[in-house]
């Protein structure tokens, strides 16, 4: 579905097997590993590309304090199971029978348990925060033309509209870029925060997703942004429940 | 069937306002974003600005400096486009249109409100 | 804000024939291309959109192709009902989403 037509690849996939077996002898590619069908005009979701990376051969100048129910993804990578619409599983499950839930993003947000662990429903991480810390430079970035470059990055790159860029935040070398989408705010064709995050994620440590595309070349007014590290938090719409021991 | 049914033609004196109204049906109004477009006699088609009806965010050309206000009423599915300040070269016909948030693609067009602006 | 320059500004043809409409934009837009069609004293209408994809609906006689910058609609028989006006539009970037100035193609 809307992949390129003259060579028949996914511009926005390369871990995709494309062919021109579509409607009318159009490209249609399908995601490694699941073998959906993706629309390659916009973002792939990210457990479809966790499920595909498994299966492949190996405003205020003050920064965001993130909330005590805010997730880090310390768990790394697993096979997930995603649903007909791509999206993942409320509850994932690895081959030892080990059962856990998971937000929208496919981040852990329960203790570990067994096949009897329920999950209701699937909770939506509604604010992520992406903080990253820059190389240094001959001088601070300029804030607005930061604040400028990311949106239109977000918006040119990830085709996330520029609404759902909350704010970018900036005390050098340390920027912070929040991206805040409740579900009642997604409107057709919108891209979900956190497809963007996991794509930026794996531009900023190159490796991109994209197609025949150059790595990120960030720059504000010429200037090279290089990132040196990157921590993503996760905050749900409802919080996390966790036993204490955990936060012991 | 998707609908988009505007108010009908205004005549307007330079400076004053004008708003027009795009009542949707057949759709879920508050899943898809809402445009505004206009296109002077003659002339090309121009972007004016969106709304997401669900939230009521916004966003404008800036060639209308401030002029231009979109807003909503989710209770009756209509849209609306406010002019102020109105000058001759404001003379158009102003269409609101559906829009799709990847592809920024209008899919379904209103019919189109002439508005007159002539002392 | 990315300027879109369509020609040419009007052709003619006769029925039966193959029409190509460029358009040209003034950085790289990807594939965010969309063609419409506008008839006198009516609404535009979506023929295309991310550059190929026929809206539905849209005979298939119309395609449209290009990437980066540079971009076609191509008609490949023209009917009676094609004669109008035809506008190229991006929707790549941050807002203003533009149009091309138009291409009117008259009846030979």
């Known amino acids: 579905h809307t992949a390129a037509q003259d060579n028949c690849t996914c511009p926005t996939n390369k871990m995709t097997v494309c062919s021109p077996d579509g409607p009318g002898g159009r490209c249609q590619c399908r995601a490694l590993g699941s073998g959906m069908a993706v629309d390659c005009s916009t973002l792939t979701s990210k457990c479809l590309l966790l499920k595909a990376r498994m299966s492949a051969p190996k405003n205020a100048r003050t920064l965001v304090r993130p909330s005590e129910h805010a997730l880090v993804d310390n768990d790394g990578l697993y096979d997930p199971d995603c649903d007909p619409e791509g999206r993942f599983k409320a509850r994932q499950c690895n081959q030892t029978s080990v059962c856990w839930c998971v937000n929208s993003v496919g981040v852990r947000r329960t203790d570990k348990g067994d096949l009897s662990l329920r999950c209701d429903e699937l909770v939506r991480t509604h604010h992520i925060l992406i903080d990253l810390r820059h190389r240094p430079t001959a001088g601070a970035f300029n804030h607005s033309d930061l604040d400028a470059e990311l949106r239109r990055l977000f918006r040119e790159r990830y085709r996330l509209h520029p609404k759902f860029v909350a704010a970018v935040h900036y005390e050098q070398p340390t920027i912070q870029i929040e991206l805040r989408q409740n579900t009642s705010q997604k409107a057709a064709g919108d891209v979900d925060i956190g497809d963007a995050a996991y794509y930026f994620e794996r531009d900023i440590k190159g490796e991109s997703l994209f197609q025949g595309r150059g790595g990120l070349d960030l720059r504000v007014r010429g200037e090279p942004l290089q990132v040196e590290r990157t921590l993503i938090y996760y905050l749900d719409e409802i919080p996390p429940k966790f036993s204490m021991k955990r936060l012991t | 069937q998707v609908q988009l049914v505007q108010s009908g033609a205004e005549v307007k004196k330079p400076g004053a306002s004008v708003k027009v109204s795009c009542k949707a049906s057949?759709?879920?109004?508050?899943?898809?974003?809402m445009h505004w477009v206009r296109q002077a006699p003659g002339q090309g088609l121009e972007w004016m600005g969106e709304?997401?009806?669900?939230?009521?965010?916004?966003s404008y050309n800036q060639k209308f400096k401030g002029r231009v206000t979109i807003t909503r009423d989710t209770s009756t599915s209509t849209a609306y486009m406010e002019l102020s300040s109105l000058r001759s070269e404001d003379t158009a016909v102003y269409y609101c249109?559906?829009?799709?948030?990847?592809?920024?693609?209008?899919?379904?067009w209103g019919q189109g409100t002439l508005v007159t602006v002539s002392s | 804000d990315i300027q879109m320059t369509q020609s040419p500004s009007s052709l003619s043809a006769s029925v039966g024939d193959r029409v190509t409409i460029t358009c040209r934009a003034s950085?790289?837009?990807?594939?965010?291309l969309n063609w419409y069609q506008q008839k006198p004293g009516k609404a535009p209408k979506l023929l295309i959109y991310?550059?190929?994809s026929l809206h539905s609906g849209v005979p298939s006689r119309f395609s449209g192709s290009g990437s980066g910058t540079d971009f076609t609609l191509t008609i490949s028989s023209l009917q009676p009902e094609d004669f109008a006006t035809y506008f190229c539009?991006?929707?790549?970037?941050?807002?203003?989403?533009?149009f091309g100035q138009g291409t009117k193609l008259e009846i030979k």
């Open positions: 249109a559906r829009g799709h948030g990847n592809y920024v693609s209008f899919d379904y």
């Open positions: 709304i997401t009806p669900s939230d009521g965010y916004t």
């Open positions: 057949g759709y879920t109004f508050t899943s898809y974003w």
């Open positions: 539009q991006q929707g790549y970037t941050l807002p203003p989403y533009t």
């Open positions: 991310y550059t190929s």
């Open positions: 950085q790289d837009i990807s594939n965010y």
